[in-house]
């Protein structure tokens, strides 16, 4: 028998520095977690103690903090090289800055293979990008070889900016011939490493003949056997065992997100490459694990540029950006409109001639807007200003909801109106009218939504049975502020870009902004 240790991360989202327990900015260092310096300590400890170790990343290193905003992926290549990752799969967020923003900072600089078998280049891009990422790689480990085959969510064109010259094929269809090719190379230990979410990971384990282990990402799935060490609730045991169509037991793993845990899986193979046993658990990277001094020193060196960036002007406002709780928790506020407009703008993807865009709606809890921005400071808006408005380090995500769920969400928005509570919704691509004289749960008297399947966008009444795409904060997607119906009834959820980054990019693009209060939210006469 031959034993392999798989160390894995996924959805790190530019958490290069240690973070608080909820993966936001570290405040009290003695209680902080994760970060590449701490990760390196643990990885090195395991490499020294065990003979056959692979360090893998399942995608979405890009996007999530000011590190990515400033360094645009160069930080990912640099620190992943320093940690000596063995392979990485491309995630959807690796395309956030377009193909060029993937090629130059990461693909050309990474000293480890970057993989995806289901992304095929065409047209002029094919010649430019070919060979920079691979469908698979064979890695010598001790006296054996291990094949790693990569995959990426086929939803990427709707979630990021890969352009029109990359085709995202069905994962299973694309993986099988590459696994077959590995088999002809006499590689009998094969790991599928990819970024399509836990459901697809399980399907790959079931359907792709020859895959021995699946290491996934995208869905931020936390798996754990025994008592979990922090706040995350396990979605199943680690590893999650899937019985393949040809009768094999295939371990599937994922390691939550944000570099908070290091996935740790031990696999025992027989001489023919069959998995005999698999066990392990994610390792919580808490403050009991010291940060590696040399990596930490490097982080501090790279940090300097971030501090300079946060005070630079992104753009100007010529109007007061009202982000006060007195406004945003009671009525339409122009800060809410600005943020929602930025959220929609960030999700413009013309992937189908029938649609002007795939999504037109935004909802945003008023309680998530934490500060106004005064225009009387020469109109200057900085990252620092935006960090005061959106201090929680969240993301603006894409969900699919039925009209009936949206209706419930808007009823919840005003179910206890008047108490300055955070659930009052700011909107984009939605016209809502409330009648507060009616009883809670029956206060939405009009709810019109902007069409997507149209050449001239216009507002139509919400249809209860129709499925709509909506951009919203991850906080709401996870049921925050009492929006349990969103969490329970959402049909699909894809993580999006860092909230501040979305707004800062929009402001930089627009240069001068002047958001108005324009009647998106109304109260019917006599009730307000």
């Amino acid at each position: 028998a031959w034993e392999l240790t798989i160390l894995h991360t996924n959805d790190v989202h530019s958490r290069l520095e240690q973070t608080s327990e909820d993966s936001s900015k570290c405040v009290n260092a003695s209680r902080c977690m994760g970060g590449v310096a701490r990760l390196f300590t643990k990885v090195q400890q395991i490499r020294r103690a065990e003979p056959n170790v692979l360090l893998l990343d399942a995608g979405d290193q890009y996007q999530g903090t000011i590190w990515f905003t400033v360094y645009k992926g160069a930080e990912v290549a640099h620190f992943m090289n320093a940690l000596r990752y063995d392979a990485m799969a491309l995630g959807n967020h690796e395309f956030d800055n377009g193909v060029e923003g993937l090629i130059e900072p990461l693909l050309k600089e990474a000293k480890f293979p970057i993989l995806s078998a289901n992304i095929k280049a065409k047209g002029p891009l094919a010649s430019q990008i070919s060979g920079l990422y691979l469908p698979y790689k064979v890695l010598p480990v001790g006296d054996e070889v291990v094949g790693i085959v990569g995959y990426t969510s086929k939803e990427t064109p709707f979630l990021s900016n890969p352009g029109t010259n990359l085709v995202f094929e069905d994962e299973i269809t694309a993986l099988q011939p590459e696994v077959d090719k590995l088999k002809t190379l006499n590689v009998n230990k094969i790991i599928a490493l990819g970024h399509s979410g836990f459901e697809m990971d399980k399907l790959i384990a079931q359907k792709v003949r020859g895959v021995d282990v699946v290491v996934g990402g995208h869905s931020n799935t936390f798996l754990y056997t025994g008592n979990p060490p922090s706040k995350e609730v396990p979605a199943g045991k680690y590893p999650f065992i899937v019985t393949s169509d040809d009768g094999r037991k295939v371990p599937v793993v994922q390691a939550y997100a944000f570099g908070k845990y290091l996935g740790y899986l031990k696999i025992e193979f027989d001489e023919r490459g069959n998995v005999i046993s698999s066990h392990g658990n994610p390792i919580l990277l808490n403050s009991s694990i010291p940060e590696d001094p040399s990596i930490k020193a490097d982080i501090n060196k790279w940090r300097i540029k971030l501090d300079n960036y946060s005070t630079q002007e992104l753009g100007k406002t010529i109007v007061y950006l009202d982000g006060s709780s007195q406004s945003c928790r009671f009525r339409e506020c122009n800060m809410g409109n600005l943020i929602c407009d930025a959220m929609i703008n960030n999700n413009l993807r013309h992937t189908d001639e029938m649609f002007w865009n795939h999504v037109s709606m935004c909802i945003l809890n008023g309680g998530g807007i934490r500060s106004p921005i005064d225009e009387r400071n020469n109109g200057t808006i900085t990252w620092e200003n935006l960090a005061a408005v959106l201090p929680f380090g969240g993301t603006f995500d894409l969900v699919q909801l039925k009209g009936s769920t949206l209706k419930k969400a808007f009823e919840h928005s005003v179910h206890r109106y008047g108490q300055s509570t955070g659930e009052f919704l700011q909107v984009g691509g939605i016209h809502v009218v409330y009648d507060l004289s009616r009883k809670p749960g029956d206060r939405v008297v009009k709810l019109d939504v902007l069409c997507t399947k149209c050449r001239v966008p216009s507002y139509d009444p919400l249809k209860m049975d129709e499925v709509y795409k909506v951009i919203l904060p991850n906080f709401l997607a996870n049921g925050g502020d009492g929006f349990q119906m969103i969490k329970d009834e959402l049909l699909r959820h894809d993580s999006g870009d860092q909230d501040i980054n979305v707004v800062s990019t929009y402001i930089s693009k627009m240069k001068v902004i002047y958001p108005a209060v324009e009647g998106r939210i109304k109260f019917s006469t006599g009730s307000h």
Epitope: S130, G131, L134, V138, D143, T184, L185, N186
Partner: antibody, heavy 117, light 107 residues
């Protein structure tokens, strides 16, 4: 440092058999395929076949089946190719070259075989 | 089997020139294209694998590109030591096949 050291020049008569060797160092012999390539004087390169020393699996170019036989001795980290029933057409330089996944990345210096009566 | 064609069998260039050598496959080889260099003494070295990946130790003046059936090798700033014959080779389908080679000479 990866090295593939091939045996020396061979002179043979038509109908003879020859066996050449490729001694390797600097890597784990059993985890890489060993490929063999033929080059006739002033000509291009022709793939003969390959052996996987880890389990002695072989794969051949149809054209060389019956002509070439590939073997490996893992204890000596050495691959062998035997050519039988030699003719003038077999006069060539023969290279051994290893492969892990995408490409034949390190080559031996070549063994020259001359078939003459 | 897949035929690999290097239309230019010999090429003459000056030191410092940018030189491009092309190679065509008889069918789509899905980027499984490698370039090998054979020096006049017979020594063979891998330069580029999977269309554009530089093999370790190969100078960055060598680059590769292409897709589908058409591929090319570029030497951006020709040096004396680059005088050699260059072979393309497909690794998509057995049997592996080579182009006829392009012999590079100095003007």
């Amino acid at each position: 440092e990866v090295q593939l050291q091939q045996s020396g020049t061979v002179l043979a008569r038509p109908g003879d058999s020859v066996k050449m060797s490729c001694k390797t160092s600097g890597y784990t012999f059993t985890t890489y395929w060993m490929h063999w390539v033929k080059q006739r004087p002033g000509q291009g390169l022709e793939w003969i076949g390959a052996i996987y020393p880890g389990n002695s699996d072989t794969t051949y170019n149809q054209k060389f089946k019956g002509k070439a036989k590939l073997t490996a001795v893992t204890s000596a980290s050495t691959a062998y190719m035997k050519l039988s029933s030699l003719t003038n057409e077999d006069s060539a330089v023969y290279y051994c070259t290893r492969l892990l996944d995408y490409a034949m990345d390190y080559w031996g210096q070549g063994t020259s075989v001359t078939v003459s009566s | 089997e897949i035929q690999m064609t290097q239309t230019t069998s010999s090429l003459s260039a000056s030191l410092g020139d940018r030189v491009t050598i092309s190679c065509r496959a008889s069918q789509d080889i899905r980027n499984y294209l490698n370039w090998h260099q054979q020096k006049p003494d017979g020594t063979v070295k891998l330069l580029i694998w999977y269309t554009s990946r530089l093999h370790s130790g190969v100078p960055s003046r060598f680059s590769g590109s292409g897709s589908g059936t058409d591929y090319s090798l570029t030497i951006s700033n020709l040096e004396q030591e680059d005088i050699a014959t260059y072979f393309c080779q497909q690794g998509n389908t057995l049997p592996w096949t080579f182009g006829g080679g392009t012999k590079l000479e100095i003007k």
